[in-house]
């Protein structure tokens, strides 16, 4: 047992060292930072034009072919849940410097759990994905 | 409406330390990371530190590493820059600023004014 | 990293348009995307204010005729008709990489 979970886990180690992960990112900052402002902006200020389209509404297209592309690399994670969960956790890590608000991390973390589920793969279970907003001091 | 007010300014000599505070309201000041950004008379900006909503993650500048330390009571709604070794050049007016949650820095404060002279 | 801005001083006549550079010594370009660049608008005595973030998105209440552009290390602020009330000093800063400012571009009407 021992010896098929080492093989185990360098199988999942080897498939994350391959799979390109960035189209998930991409695909999930997209999706929680349609309007950045939502969560800080001043109720007393103007909002912008509604009629002028957003910078995010020109790149809908854009953000569909990430998902397309980020539900293709998870697609290689569907048959153990734990690397799944790797997978899951190394996104985290790599934008966890980016999200520098209570509200914005737990909007990614939301959405991040949700991904295999909008790919049509089973999510895992159990998988921590704490961090605090700003990630490591990576300075 | 977002309020920011720092104070705690005034005029010390080098190698003296102050402490700089920044009352926030209109917000919920334990959700977001904070900054001090300062500017010296005349000339530009200059972004002197940040501190994580939990107050895990610190970061600082080259120029105030090992002299300044930020920190914050999220109980008190409140950001704090405790400066030490003060030097001529950390004369400045000293603002906080609160980051939008994406890394940008949406509200300002009016600043405070730090002297170092002798 | 590293921000330079042109020009450093920018004389422009009323209802002219007006164009600021901001050139960053590495690529602003998260593997997110995004590009961490804004601008921010600092009048005579007053606290700075953010016009754009992430390059190009205009932020809320900041009139249309500013807009931001560029992407890697080059960018530009645009305004398309100079108002009176834009006089003061531009700032570009990036967020890459912890944060930094460029030097300021001063603004004045002829």
């Known amino acids: 047992r021992q010896q098929w979970e080492l093989q185990g886990d360098r199988r999942c180690q080897s498939q994350l060292e391959r799979a390109n992960l960035r189209p998930c990112e991409q695909h999930l900052m997209q999706k929680i930072q349609r309007d950045e402002d939502s969560y800080g902006r001043d109720p007393y200020s103007p909002s912008q034009d509604p009629y002028s389209p957003s910078p995010y509404d020109r790149r809908g297209a854009g953000s569909s072919q990430h998902q397309e592309r980020c539900c293709n690399e998870l697609n290689e994670f569907e048959n153990n849940q734990r690397c799944m969960c790797e997978a899951l956790q190394q996104i985290m890590e790599n934008q966890s410097d980016r999200l520098q608000g209570r509200q914005q991390e737990q909007q990614f973390k939301r959405e991040l759990r949700n991904l295999p589920q909008q790919c049509g793969l089973r999510a895992p279970q159990r998988c921590d994905l704490e961090v605090e907003s700003g990630g490591r001091d990576r300075y | 409406e977002v309020q920011l007010v720092e104070s705690g300014g005034g005029l010390v000599q080098p190698g003296g330390s102050l402490r700089l505070s920044c009352a926030a309201s209109g917000f919920a000041f334990n959700d977001y990371t904070m900054h001090w950004v300062r500017q010296a008379p005349g000339k530009g900006l200059e972004w002197v530190s940040a501190i994580s909503y939990g107050g895990t993650n610190k970061y600082y500048a080259d120029s105030v590493k090992g002299r300044f330390t930020i920190s914050r009571d999220n109980s008190k709604n409140t950001l704090y820059l405790q400066m030490n070794s003060l030097r001529a050049e950390d004369t400045a007016v000293y603002y906080c600023?609160?980051?939008?949650?994406?890394?940008?820095?949406?509200?300002w404060g009016q600043g405070t004014l730090v002297t170092v002279s002798s | 990293i590293v921000l330079t801005q042109s020009p450093l001083s920018l004389p422009v006549t009323l209802g002219q348009p007006a164009s600021i550079s901001c050139r960053s010594s590495?690529?602003?370009?998260?593997?997110?995307?995004?590009?961490?660049l804004d601008w921010f608008h600092q009048r005579p005595g007053q606290s700075p204010r953010r016009l754009i973030y992430?390059?190009?998105k205009r932020a809320s209440g900041v009139p249309d005729r500013f807009s931001g552009s560029g992407s890697g290390t080059d960018f530009t602020l645009k305004i398309s008709r100079v108002d009176a009330e834009d006089v003061g000093v531009y700032y570009c800063m990036q967020a890459l990489q912890t944060w930094t400012f460029g030097q300021g571009t001063k603004l004045t009407v002829l």
């Open positions: 590495q690529s602003l370009v998260h593997r997110n995307g995004y590009n961490y």
């Open positions: 600023a609160k980051d939008s949650g994406y890394r940008s820095l949406l509200h």
């Open positions: 992430m390059a190009s």
